[in-house]
Structure formats: structure tokens, C-alpha cells
């Protein structure tokens, strides 16, 4: 059985393959009840959290999760040795740096203790899954009397991410966004100056070191105005 | 003439699920990021969520995050609200509004009810 | 989050009169405020943005003012159809948007 993992906002990430083995009988068994599916993420290549819902279950079960990397020199099959819980139900299973293997094929098994023919197996690709801390430390200089460049710093590579850039001033109705590659800057070359700006930076893994499709939280906002110009004419950072 | 007119409405049971959707006209859709405001009876006016002009970003507001899904065709000038795990604190006229956070158009709203 | 607080709540008013709401929030938000006007069944209706600036189609009897954490809705002289609801918004450091509670404008 072929399936595709959907990405939270929506996006096909990975494909997956699900092996059910099932007991060869004419009665439904509980061991032919499918098993949740799980999702995957890597924060900042700190620490990943795989994840289920365990709700879904038709009675409560604590579901157990092995995980290995195929073809490599991580192929022994470990147990997860950090589970996260919902309602004293494991929903989850944390893994530390040290055991994320980005280039490598990674595989998660699910199973069903008390049915252990009962088990689902998915193969993800974790540079795809990949989703970066948001961008921080936002500062903007004014270049000239109209230019503004907005810069900003990430805890991770520089050069594996992407961004987008959200601005607006207090007379818009929307935001206006513009991506931006690796080199985390971007410049306003015509500034309002009885206007106030606000601009805001995401980051995502994609697309020189990963393929990822979800993006990091937006930073804090930093704002930028007539009032406030005048105290520092070449830099000024506010955060809200 | 700015038309937003909003259906999906109805009664639905705690926990239950509705779709609402926002039918816009009169202006040029894909260059206003759109919002939901609600309003709970004799109450005032509440942000829920709001999408940007391409639809590739949202926010919401903690009473809803996880909860609620925002989305919008741009194709056929519309927006919409995925409400699921609706709750009695849900029951509200909901609007739809242009802009991301200055709401310069409004339609009359939907009434959504959760009551057991 | 952003806490914006409207005084009076409410207020009683005769046409002609000149009248003022007052926003205050609960920190700085420059000049990222809006006021709508709402009546009874109907749909609200901006009529400032940015503090200041009146909305396309808006009577210029309506203005608003200030900057930083107060703000002020000033109608300068009362017309029948200006009693209704009024409600400033603050657009400064979102999500979330907050608006302030509410100031209902009743006839004298």
C-alpha cells in the first residue's frame, strides 16, 4: 500500500511506503485496523519529533516506534528511547541530534504491542522535513534618504535557507512579501517617510541543502517610522 | 459595488465541524489579503484569522489555532473557514473581511451556533 | 498581546453635539490604529485608518487623532444616522489584532 504523507500546510512532502501485515482470516482482526501515521519533523537539526494521533485508535494504546536508516551504517533498528505523551498515551517519539541522519533514508516503524503483526512502516527523506527556527536579531539600516535595508540573522547554515520578506505601513490593508535567497537581506529602495513600516522574515530549508516545503515561524515584527528615524538616522531596531 | 457575502453556516454539536466560505466581488480579490472576524451575540468584534493575498501564509488567533484552517481561491474570488472541534464559545455571527488587518470591506456574516 | 481599552463604554448625545471616543493602549502601537463604525444588524464600517486618515466616502464630520497609546474619535457635529457602535483596532504588533471593547453613541 502506496500512501502520501501531506506536510501540515497541505504540501505532498515524502512518499511513504505502509507495510500491514494481516492475519490471513475472514473475520476483521484487530490486526488489520490501520495504524496512524506518522509525521516527522526536524527542528533546526537540534532535535526531531515524530509524531501520531494517538487519538485515532479505537481504545487507547500505547503504541510503540523503532526507527533505522536504510542502506547505511545505520541500519540497526533502535527503539525510541524519549516518547511523547497525550493523556498518558504515547502520541510521539523524540530524537536528539546525534541520532538524525539527514541524507540518509529514515525509516519509522509504528506498532501495536499487544498485536505485534499489527505495524506500519514509512521511509521519509529528513532534509525535506526540515524546518528552521525563526529568524532573529532583525535590524534595519537606512542606506539613503529612501533606501532601507532590513538584515536578519538564523541559527543554523546560512546557506541552506530561503526567506520571505512581509512589509506593510500602517495606511496598508496587506501585507507585500518578497523572497529572498541565502543572503539574508533585502532592501526598500523607495521609503515613505510620513509613513510607519513593519516587516516581518520566515525562513525555510529549501532548496540548495533540502527540498523542504514548511516554513519556520515568522520572526518578531520590527518596526521603522517618521517619528522615529530622527533618533538614529542610519540604523534603528524595534521590536515589538 | 464591494459584495462579501458569507454562507456554511448552521447548528452543529460541540466537537462537530463546519465549512464556511466568503464569496467576494466588486474589487480585485488577489490584491487583498482577506480576514474572519466574529461576533458573539451582544458581544464585540473578535479576530480569528488572516490569509495573505497568495494564500502561502496565515494567522490566527490562540482561541482557534489548531482548530481552524483559512484558505482562499483565488481563482474563484473566495475565502474560506475550516472550523473543526467547534466549541460552545464558537457560537458567533462570522464575517469576512478584506484586508489582512485593516478591513476596509465587510459582508453581513454567517451565524454559526454549537450547542448540544 | 495588545490590550485596547475604549472609554466611555457608552454614551448619550444630541444631533448637533460634538462628540468624542477615546482608545488607549496598552503599549506604544504608533499610529496602527482603525475605527469602525457598527449599527444594529449590520456589518461594520471603516472609517479611519492610520490613526488619521479618513476612509474613502467616510463624512468629513468624523476625525481622528493621536499617537503612541491614545487615541481619539472625534464627530463634529451629530448627525441621526451617527448613533450606532463605534470600534478602534490596533494593527501594530499582530496576531493577534485586537480590538477594544466598544463604545455604544445613544440618542439623549
Known amino acids: 500500500l502506496n500512501t502520501t504523507i501531506l506536510t501540515p500546510n497541505g504540501n505532498e512532502d515524502t512518499t511513504a511506503d505502509f507495510f500491514l501485515t494481516t492475519m490471513p482470516t475472514d473475520s476483521l482482526s484487530v490486526s488489520t485496523l490501520p495504524l496512524p501515521e506518522v509525521q516527522c519533523f526536524v527542528f533546526n537539526v537540534e532535535y526531531m519529533n515524530c509524531t501520531w494521533n494517538s487519538s485515532s485508535e479505537p481504545q487507547p494504546t500505547n503504541l510503540t516506534l523503532h526507527y533505522w536508516y536504510k542502506n547505511s551504517d545505520n541500519d540497526k533498528v533502535q527503539k525510541c528511547s524519549h516518547y511523547l505523551f497525550s493523556e498518558e498515551i504515547t502520541s510521539g517519539c523524540q530524537l536528539q541530534k546525534k541520532e538524525i541522519h539527514l541524507y540518509q533514508t529514515f525509516v519509522v516503524q509504528l506498532q501495536d504491542p499487544r498485536e505485534p503483526r499489527r505495524q506500519a512502516t514509512q521511509m521519509l527523506k529528513l532534509q525535506n522535513l526540515v524546518i528552521p527556527w525563526a529568524p532573529e536579531n532583525l535590524t534595519l539600516h537606512k542606506l539613503s534618504e529612501s533606501q532601507l535595508e532590513l538584515n536578519w540573522n538564523n541559527r543554523f547554515l546560512n546557506h541552506c535557507l530561503e526567506h520571505l520578506v512581509q512589509y506593510r505601513t500602517d495606511w496598508d490593508h496587506s501585507w507585500t512579501e518578497q523572497s529572498v535567497d541565502y543572503r539574508h537581506k533585502f532592501s526598500l529602495p523607495s521609503v515613505d517617510g510620513q509613513k510607519r513600516y513593519t516587516f516581518r522574515v520566515r525562513s525555510r530549508f529549501n532548496p540548495l541543502c533540502g527540498s523542504a516545503q514548511h516554513w519556520s515561524e515568522w520572526s518578531h515584527p520590527i518596526h521603522w517610522g517618521s517619528n522615529t528615524s530622527k533618533e538614529n538616522p542610519f540604523l534603528f531596531a524595534l521590536e515589538a | 459595488e464591494v459584495q462579501l457575502v458569507e454562507s456554511g453556516g448552521g447548528v452543529v454539536r460541540p466537537g462537530g465541524s463546519l465549512r464556511l466560505s466568503c464569496a467576494a466581488s466588486g474589487f480585485t480579490f488577489d490584491d487583498y489579503g482577506m480576514s474572519w472576524v466574529r461576533q458573539a451575540p451582544g458581544k464585540g468584534l473578535e479576530w480569528i484569522s488572516s490569509?495573505?493575498?497568495?494564500?502561502?501564509?496565515?494567522d490566527y488567533a490562540d482561541s482557534v489555532k489548531g482548530r481552524f484552517t483559512i484558505s482562499r481561491d483565488n481563482a474563484k474570488n473566495s475565502l474560506f473557514l475550516q472550523m473543526s472541534s467547534l466549541r460552545a464559545e464558537d457560537t458567533a455571527l462570522y464575517h469576512c473581511?478584506?484586508?489582512?488587518?485593516?478591513?476596509?470591506?465587510w459582508g453581513q456574516g454567517t451565524l454559526v451556533t454549537v450547542s448540544s | 498581546d495588545i490590550q485596547m481599552t475604549q472609554s466611555p463604554s457608552s454614551l448619550s448625545a444630541s444631533v448637533g453635539d460634538r462628540v468624542t471616543i477615546t482608545c488607549r493602549a496598552s503599549q506604544s502601537i504608533s499610529s496602527y490604529l482603525n475605527w469602525y463604525q457598527q449599527k444594529p444588524g449590520k456589518a461594520p464600517k471603516l472609517l479611519i485608518y492610520?490613526?488619521?486618515s479618513l476612509q474613502s466616502g467616510v463624512p468629513s464630520r468624523f476625525s481622528g487623532s493621536g499617537s503612541g497609546t491614545d487615541f481619539t474619535l472625534t464627530i463634529s457635529s451629530l448627525q441621526p444616522e451617527d448613533f450606532a457602535t463605534y470600534y478602534c483596532q490596533q494593527s501594530y504588533s499582530t496576531p493577534p489584532i485586537t480590538f477594544g471593547q466598544g463604545t455604544r453613541l445613544e440618542i439623549k
Open positions: 473581511a478584506s484586508g489582512e488587518f485593516r478591513f476596509d470591506y
Open positions: 490569509i495573505n493575498r497568495n494564500g502561502g501564509s496565515a
Open positions: 492610520a490613526a488619521s
